[in-house]
Interface confidence: low
């Protein structure tokens, strides 16, 4: 090989070895039959050498600095090129490395041709090993401002008093330009500048100079974003450190257009602003930190760019302003297992703050929008508490649960819309009374239904859930002793259609001591599938629960026990059932933990079954399904 | 309850392919990953790729690929691994377990199925 | 692909002392970093999740720290029943990795 470098080119050529490797035979430079390890060419000079092992590669590496000085002369701006030329170097991984010196009031600026840069954060590669390491200079101290792959957004970098820029080539790499120029500006008054393009969608990831170390001491930092009009953009901080302040505050200012209140001033730990249409500048403002202990400053943030849907130009007034106890949350969808790129998808609160996800409370009129691709990837979970602290005043009153229309006109799917229903301990009970009758959700006849209603207690020391029913039954009302939380949860998005058969009025009645009691009203024909609360975990202990079964007076029930036994083992106590006839009185009494279960019985008249467990074993649960069904009296039951 | 039930022990001659099972219940199978993990005796775990559950597709980390297919029966909520010229190496306990959140954790695991190649 | 180092490769203990298990990974990964329980003929069970997230139904004595490439399992006060192999593995990016492993053994 033969490295020549013209007088006064301000160019040093410096082979020296790598990071060691475990190879057993080392590798030498061989010049004028001397071995040695290191060899630095300077301005002037011209050396023939040689290596003393086939791929020196694994060896050594090339770094060729050369120096601008623009603080005694003209500067020399425009393209920057690869000199000496790649192909007269050898294979090794190469750093060519330009430092820039300037006055401070002269602002130097890196333009980058296509392709733009991409930042990339400790410990992270370039797939293609081709890595830009920019630095800028404050008096003496270099800051690093970052290191950047190709195929990314960033265009521009303007900086003032100095400017160190290293690209780093693999060995194998055909590059042979160095794809930026530089250019002189007015004094930029900043740390730096970086511009950062997006033609279409997409994403760019940024950060503080000297991440993950602290950012400067009360610099200032710029990022200029341009953006096609078309699109939107939302910024999100990933990770940010405050430094502790004696004087002054850190803080990022945006300057967006259209906005009146230029620039706009957020904490760093504030929700930062979407939905931005056009350009917009970003920038770090550091402070004056305390000496003794000053803590750092650093940022790292994602910008993303994307199309805005028909819905983000659309405003939805959510009014809960006549609501109590109520909050609503529209929030992402569990996600299914997708590495890849996806848009964001946001909801937004006045169009500006946007975030993954938004709760609304109640007492207030909200204006949401939304940014996002595809809104199926939301849904609405909303909470809701009816309490009566005052038995008195509470006795006999009636609520509707019904979901409000402004929460079913949204774009989003709902998800779940919880009622806790809270009365005073052993003062009040309740009754559910749906407008259509309901149905329970069996293994054997599972509801199909775009909704259903799920009940389960509210007392947080008991495990105790009832069910889940949907419209299309025979259940007429369901009381249950005390506090109960009753969720609609949806199936599917033809709820917007079925939202009229949703309907359930809750009322407050005097206090009884069973846990459940259902009213069923069979239909002629169709079989009722009932089973017991908790179903899979048992019935708690100690609890007990009632059916009250209508028979009509031309119709005879059938009574059918699914299983020969209960299977309860009882610990303490005794688990029995009483079918009882309502007219005669006549009661039947069943050992649930010793007798079988009754073969199908025939009522002709409305009937009770109560089922009361004792303290079971554990794994030995008191879990029964049964039916009944109704015929007409003309059927021969021999 | 979530349950991840794996099929039974198996015994291998060299050259001969295997199918293990994970059958799971108590979920819903395409709502979270599915990810295989090998367990060679006296060793440690390693994590041999996962299946997206909700297209099939699966992923392997560089030491599985070619011998090994993952795939699924979703109508029987079931994964499956398929290992084809066994080699004496790949005995091994291996297990399934279901994947949390967009960087998953293990938050369930099967019994665990022990095949072993031996001629 | 991430490499994660445990140590030490085995610790012995009494019953009521503190134990502390450490997992180094080979480049920074945040805090996507989980550990797990092993017993023998057993399959792994979950512990602790992203570091320091504690897990529904594991005792209170396990608790996790660390974040970027040193990471700390911690048992306040080691019962019987904790003497078991215990791994780290990273959820940092493809490949997951798992470490080699600390054995938890009675003294």
């Known amino acids: 090989f033969e490295i020549a470098l013209p007088r006064e080119s301000n160019i040093t050529v410096l082979i020296k070895l790598g990071t060691p490797t475990l190879l057993a035979k080392p590798c030498y430079i061989v010049i004028s039959k001397r071995h040695i390890t290191m060899l630095s060419i300077k301005s002037g000079e011209r050396i023939v050498f040689t290596f003393s092992c086939q791929s020196p590669e694994n060896h050594f590496v090339i770094e060729i600095q050369k120096n601008i000085d623009c603080m005694s002369g003209p500067c020399p701006f425009g393209e920057v090129q690869l000199q000496p030329s790649t192909s007269l170097l050898p294979t090794l991984n190469r750093t060519f490395i330009w430092d820039v010196k300037a006055h401070k009031s002269i602002g130097l600026e890196l333009q980058f041709s296509i392709p733009r840069l991409r930042q990339i954060g400790p410990g992270e590669s370039c797939p293609d090993g081709v890595t830009h390491s920019i630095s800028g200079r404050i008096d003496a101290t270099v800051v690093r401002i970052g290191t950047f792959c190709s195929n990314g957004t960033v265009s521009r970098i303007k900086m003032q008093e100095g400017v160190k820029m290293a690209l780093h080539l693999p060995w194998f790499h055909p590059r042979n330009v160095s794809g930026f120029s530089i250019a002189n500006r007015s004094s930029i008054k900043r740390l730096c500048i970086i511009e950062s393009v997006f033609e279409g969608e997409g994403s760019a990831t940024l950060m503080s100079a000297n991440y993950p170390e602290g950012f400067p001491e009360d610099e200032l930092m710029t990022w200029q974003f341009v953006v096609p009009a078309h699109l939107r953009a939302s910024v999100s901080f990933l990770n940010f450190n405050l430094s502790n302040c004696e004087r002054k505050e850190e803080r990022v200012e945006y300057y967006i257009p259209g906005s009146t209140t230029n620039p706009e001033v957020f904490k760093l730990e504030d929700k930062q602003p979407g939905n931005m249409a056009g350009n917009f500048n970003l920038s770090l403002q550091g402070c004056d930190q305390d000496a003794q202990s000053p803590g750092i400053l650093r940022l790292q943030f994602q910008v993303l760019v994307q199309h805005p849907q028909n819905e983000s130009n659309k405003i939805y007034v959510v009014d809960l302003s006549n609501e109590r106890a109520m909050s609503l949350t529209i929030e992402p969808r569990p996600v299914k297992q997708s590495r890849k790129f996806v848009p964001g998808c946001f909801v937004c609160l006045e169009s500006r703050t946007c975030s993954s996800n938004l709760t609304l409370t109640s007492g207030s009129k909200h204006k949401i929008s939304f940014l996002c691709d595809d809104l199926t990837r939301l849904w609405m979970n909303v909470e809701k508490t009816i309490s009566c602290t005052d038995h008195r005043y509470c006795q006999r009153k009636s609520y509707s649960l019904q979901v409000p229309s402004d929460i079913l006109h949204l774009p989003v799917e709902l998800h779940d819309f919880s009622w806790k229903l809270l009365v005073p301990k052993d003062r009040l009970s309740l009754v559910l009374v749906p407008a259509q009758k309901l149905q329970q959700h069996t293994h054997e006849k599972p509801c199909n239904t775009s909704f259903s209603y799920l009940v389960a207690s509210a007392i947080p020391s008991q495990d105790l859930y009832f069910g889940s029913f949907c419209p299309g039954g025979s259940i007429k009302q369901i009381q249950v002793k005390q506090n109960i939380s009753v969720t609609l949860r949806t199936f599917a998005p033809s709820f917007q259609q079925e939202a009229s058969r949703q309907g359930l009025t809750v009322s407050f009645i005097p206090y009884f001591k069973e846990e459940g009691v259902f009213t069923v009203t069979p239909d002629t024909k169709s079989k009722v599938y009932l089973r017991t609360p908790n179903w899979d975990r048992g019935l708690p202990s100690l609890t007990s629960v009632s059916w009250n079964i209508s028979v009509p007076r031309d119709q005879v029930a059938c009574l059918t026990f699914f299983k020969e036994r209960s299977g309860v083992v009882c610990q303490t106590g005794r688990a029995f059932m009483i079918i009882q006839e309502q007219r005669t009185r006549a009661e039947e009494i069943f050992s649930l933990d010793e007798d079988v279960l009754p073969k199908p019985s025939f009522h002709h008249h409305s009937f009770w079954v109560n089922i009361s467990n004792c303290s079971p074993t554990s794994g030995k649960q008191l879990d029964l399904l049964f039916s009944v069904t109704l015929t007409p009296r003309t059927v021969d039951l021999t | 309850q979530v349950q991840l039930v794996q099929s039974g022990s198996e015994l291998k001659k060299p050259g001969a392919s295997v199918k293990v099972s994970c059958k799971a219940s108590g979920y819903t199978l395409t709502d979270f990953s599915m990810h295989w993990v090998r367990q060679a005796p006296g060793q440690g775990l390693e994590w041999m790729g996962w299946?997206?559950?909700?297209?099939?597709?699966?992923t392997y980390a560089d030491d599985f690929k070619g011998r090994f297919v993952l795939s699924l029966d979703t109508s029987v909520s079931t994964a499956y691994l398929q290992i084809s010229s066994l080699k004496a190496e790949d005995t091994a306990v291996y297990y399934c377990?279901?994947?949390?959140?967009?960087?998953?954790?293990?938050?369930?695991w099967g019994q665990g199925t022990l095949v072993t190649v031996s001629s | 692909e991430i490499v994660l180092t445990q140590s030490p490769a085995t610790l012995s203990l009494s019953p009521g002392e503190r134990a502390t298990l450490s997992c180094r990974a080979s480049?920074?990964?945040?805090?996507?970093l989980h550990w797990y329980q092993q017993k023998p003929g057993q399959s792994p069970r979950l512990l602790i999740k992203?570091?320091?997230q504690s897990i529904s139904g594991i005792p209170a004595r396990f608790s996790g720290s660390g974040s970027g490439s040193d990471f700390t399992l911690t048992i306040s006060s080691v019962e019987p029943e904790d003497f078991a192999v215990y791994y780290c593995?990273?959820?940092?990016?493809?490949?997951?990795?798992f470490g080699q492993g600390t054995k938890l053994e009675i003294k």
């Open positions: 992203y570091a320091s």
């Open positions: 377990s279901r994947g949390r959140d967009y960087d998953p954790h293990f938050d369930y």
């Open positions: 593995q990273s959820a940092h990016s493809f490949p997951y990795t």
């Open positions: 480049q920074s990964i945040s805090d996507f």
């Open positions: 299946i997206n559950t909700e297209t099939g597709a699966p």
